[in-house]
């Protein structure tokens, strides 16, 4: 296993609709054809997997149908979008990138993006 640098923004504020997007960029040492991207959430020293996708270079990322993540890739950058976020989902979202094929296997883990989320104000009841 060889180490690889992964960069991601330090802080992102989710939209009022609970959507946060950020770019995860990795310094690919070679010509990988198969890449796996995993988003981990760290909150109060507990780490959980949010979503993961394996893709072939040049193709779209495919997350599971029920995943809260979507993404696109361009070269050594992955643009990740996480939706359905609530205030309780505030935390550090870490991008983990694995170059699966061809060998050698490379692993890179970013420092994390702190995503802040605020629940939208409830709409006042309207009289119709």
């Amino acid at each position: 296993c060889k180490a690889m640098h992964v960069a991601q923004p330090a802080v992102v504020l989710a939209s009022s609709r609970g959507i946060a997007s950020f770019v995860c960029e990795y310094a690919s040492p070679g010509k990988a054809t198969e890449v796996r991207v995993t988003v981990l959430r760290q909150a109060d020293s507990q780490v959980t997997e949010v979503c993961a996708a394996t893709y072939m270079m040049g193709n779209e990322l495919t997350f599971l149908d029920d995943s809260i993540c979507t993404g696109t890739s361009s070269g050594n950058q992955v643009n990740l979008t996480i939706q359905g976020l609530r205030a309780m989902d505030t935390g550090l979202y870490i991008c983990k990138v694995e170059l699966m094929y061809p060998p050698p296997y490379y692993l890179g883990i970013g420092n994390g993006t702190q995503i802040y989320v605020i629940d939208p104000e409830p709409c006042p009841d309207s009289d119709f």
Epitope: V11, V12, L13, A14, S15, T90
Partner: antibody, heavy 117, light 107 residues
Framework: QVQLVQSGPEVKKPGASVKVSCKAS????????IGWVRQAPGQGLEWMGW????????NYVQKFQGRVTMTTDTSTNTAYMELRSPRSDDTAVYYC??????????WGQGTLVTVSS | EIVLTQSPDFQSVTPKEKVTITCRAS??????LHWYQQKPDQSPKLLIK???QSFSGVPSRFSGSGSGTDFTLTINSLEAEDAATYYC?????????FGPGTKVDIK
């Protein structure tokens, strides 16, 4: 090293908008946020809200909602805070501060805004 | 919003004495509590992040502890230059909030 340099003192009449700038250097501007904090004379620190320089999203404290606008210019690494319809009780030192994963870490030198007729 | 309370409001201390300042949150904030020092006519400076992690360049006499709702800032062997107001700050949830501050002066 991280530096936040704010614009100079302002004297405004009640109702006349004020806009404070905050120029950042020494780090990747779009990777962080910029928060705004004010401190009335002899008082404590009051959080006003912040803007994510990465995507431009903002979060304002309710009491300032509708009266404050926070923006960034990523081409010049500068953040702005505009306060509309200021009153005499808005007289304070206004600080910008970098928002990182550990809340606020670096602060500007402060800008004294005096609202007086 | 999360309300932070600090105690004491004011403390007058002799040099070399130990100072303890507490900060209590209105609900659990994990370890997302940070401490700042503000001297007269200066900007606040970060001392301790995430309850117990020293920020770069901060003297070792400053330390922090706690998690959940109760936190403590300790200044071991106070020096004259430590005369300042100390604020706690939470970044657990929006909107961020500050404690009211604790003023420490030298006897």
């Amino acid at each position: 090293q991280v530096q936040l340099v704010q614009s100079g003192p302002e004297v405004k009449k009640p109702g006349a908008s004020v806009k404070v700038s905050c120029k950042a250097s020494g780090y990747t501007f779009t990777s962080y946020g910029i928060g705004w904090v004010r401190q009335a004379p002899g008082q404590g620190l009051e959080w006003m809200g912040w803007i994510s320089a990465y995507n431009g999203n903002t979060n304002y404290v309710q009491k300032f909602q509708g009266r404050v606008t926070m923006t960034t210019d990523t081409s010049t690494n500068t953040a702005y805070m505009e306060l509309r319809s200021p009153r005499s009780d808005d007289t304070a030192v206004y600080y910008c501060a970098r928002v990182g994963s550990s809340g606020v870490d670096y602060w500007g030198q402060g800008t004294l805004v005096t609202v007086s007729s | 919003e999360i309300v932070l309370t600090q105690s004491p409001d004011f403390q007058s201390v002799t040099p070399k004495e130990k100072v303890t300042i507490t900060c209590r949150a209105s609900q659990s904030i994990g370890s997302s509590l940070h401490w700042y020092q503000q001297k007269p006519d200066q900007s606040p400076k970060l001392l301790i992040k995430y309850a117990s992690q020293s920020f770069s360049g901060v003297p070792s006499r400053f330390s922090g502890s706690g998690s959940g709702t109760d936190f403590t800032l300790t200044i071991n062997s106070l020096e004259a230059e430590d005369a300042a107001t100390y604020y706690c700050h939470q970044s657990s949830s929006l909107p961020f909030t500050f404690g009211p501050g604790t003023k420490v002066d030298i006897k």
